[in-house]
């Protein structure tokens, strides 16, 4: 039974050429977590391996850098980083819990954080 | 290599305590959940539960709550089975199985502990 | 508790046979089903998981199939040392496993 809840950074947005943390923590399950991906749209940028370590996706390598913990952070931001980012958690038993981040990148010198949210 | 060693046979009495170990070798023990299954003489496979090796957080299922405890030892990579008050019942075989796989379209049990009998007898 | 049902219990083949083992869930558990492999005294080795995925080192003549509710287990010529008994387990929620198959020689 999944009892398990993802919260996220929830809807950002960033300044063009900056970076920006993704995040997603999961709770209230006993599951163990085995491997996090992270997807942007259909495409995969990251995975992090609860043995293995990391893997950057080599056409993100660049600008992708892993963590802070399980999160990513997105380097060099352009107008076409905005866009919605997903969190996979890979847990025995509970199997697949996903978050969902907005990321809005601006061109002017203004960008206000949203606030946090869950998702069940 | 990827093993898993458990403790020899034991022959309890009734009332009786026993503690199976389950040592893993060969790879990082806290990255992969172990598994309890037991076996009753001449019968099929029943999964008793698991244990988290990251929290240490044991999960039971049906039937395995009250007298059936799991633990682990992380810094000799070993996961141990403690039934107290046998009865003549929980006379089986043991074993501890790693899930193996990251995603969970892989998850199944690769490596499986050599098993234990348990043998509960006045 | 999702429940899996494994026919036939008991079978007897020949070697070079064909075999084929049916595992059905009591619901959908889409292709989180694995096949394990046990001779008398020995643990249960892994044959296959995710449904069809051959574990490293199973011989090419053992072959997975289906999801949902049915699976299927293939044996596409009977070797000497497959004489064994064969159980489906179930990954989708907390593990099951199916009543089991002996496979014995005719």
């Known amino acids: 039974m999944m009892t398990g809840t993802i919260e996220t950074t929830g809807n950002i947005s960033a300044e063009k050429g900056g970076s920006i943390i993704l995040q997603c923590h999961l709770s209230s399950t006993t599951a163990q977590v085995t491997q996090v991906n992270w997807e942007q749209q259909d495409q995969l940028l990251a995975i992090c391996n609860a043995d293995l370590g990391w893997h950057i996706s080599p056409s993100f390598k660049d600008r992708v850098a892993p963590g802070p913990g399980l999160g990513l952070t997105l380097q060099s931001l352009t107008v076409n980083d905005t866009g919605e980012y997903f969190c996979i958690y890979h847990t025995y038993p509970d199997g697949t819990y996903t978050g969902r981040i907005f990321l809005e990148v601006l061109e002017s010198s203004v960008a206000e954080h949203g606030a946090r949210f869950q998702i069940p | 290599q990827v093993q898993l060693v458990q403790s020899g046979s034991e022959l309890k009495k009734p009332g009786a305590s026993v503690k199976v170990s389950c040592k893993a070798s060969?790879?990082?023990?806290?990255?992969?959940?172990m598994n309890w299954v037991r076996q009753a003489p001449g019968q099929g496979l029943e999964w008793m539960g698991w244990?988290?090796?990251?929290?240490?957080?044991?999960t039971y299922a049906q039937g395995f709550t009250g007298r059936f405890v799991f633990s682990l030892d992380t810094s000799v990579s070993t996961a141990y089975l403690q039934i107290s008050s046998l009865k003549a019942e929980d006379t089986a075989v043991y074993y501890c199985?790693?899930?193996?796989?990251?995603?969970?379209?892989?998850?199944?049990?690769?490596?499986w502990g050599q098993g234990t009998l348990v043998t509960v007898s006045s | 508790d999702i429940q899996l049902t494994q026919s036939p219990s008991f079978l007897s083949a020949s070697v070079g046979d064909r075999v084929t083992i049916t595992c059905r869930a009591s619901q959908g558990i889409s292709s989180y089903l694995a096949w394990y492999q046990q001779k008398p005294g020995k643990a249960p080795k892994l044959l296959i998981y995710?449904?069809?995925t051959l574990q490293s080192g199973v011989p090419s003549r053992f072959s997975g199939s289906g999801s949902g509710t049915e699976f299927t287990l293939t044996i596409s010529s009977l070797q000497p040392e497959d004489f064994a008994t064969y159980y489906c387990q179930q990954l989708s929620s907390y593990p099951t496993f199916g009543g089991g198959t002996k496979v014995e020689i005719k």
């Open positions: 995710a449904a069809s």
């Open positions: 199985a790693r899930v193996g796989g990251y995603s969970v379209d892989e998850y199944a049990f690769d490596v």
């Open positions: 244990i988290n090796t990251n929290t240490g957080n044991p």
């Open positions: 060969g790879y990082t023990f806290t990255s992969y959940p």
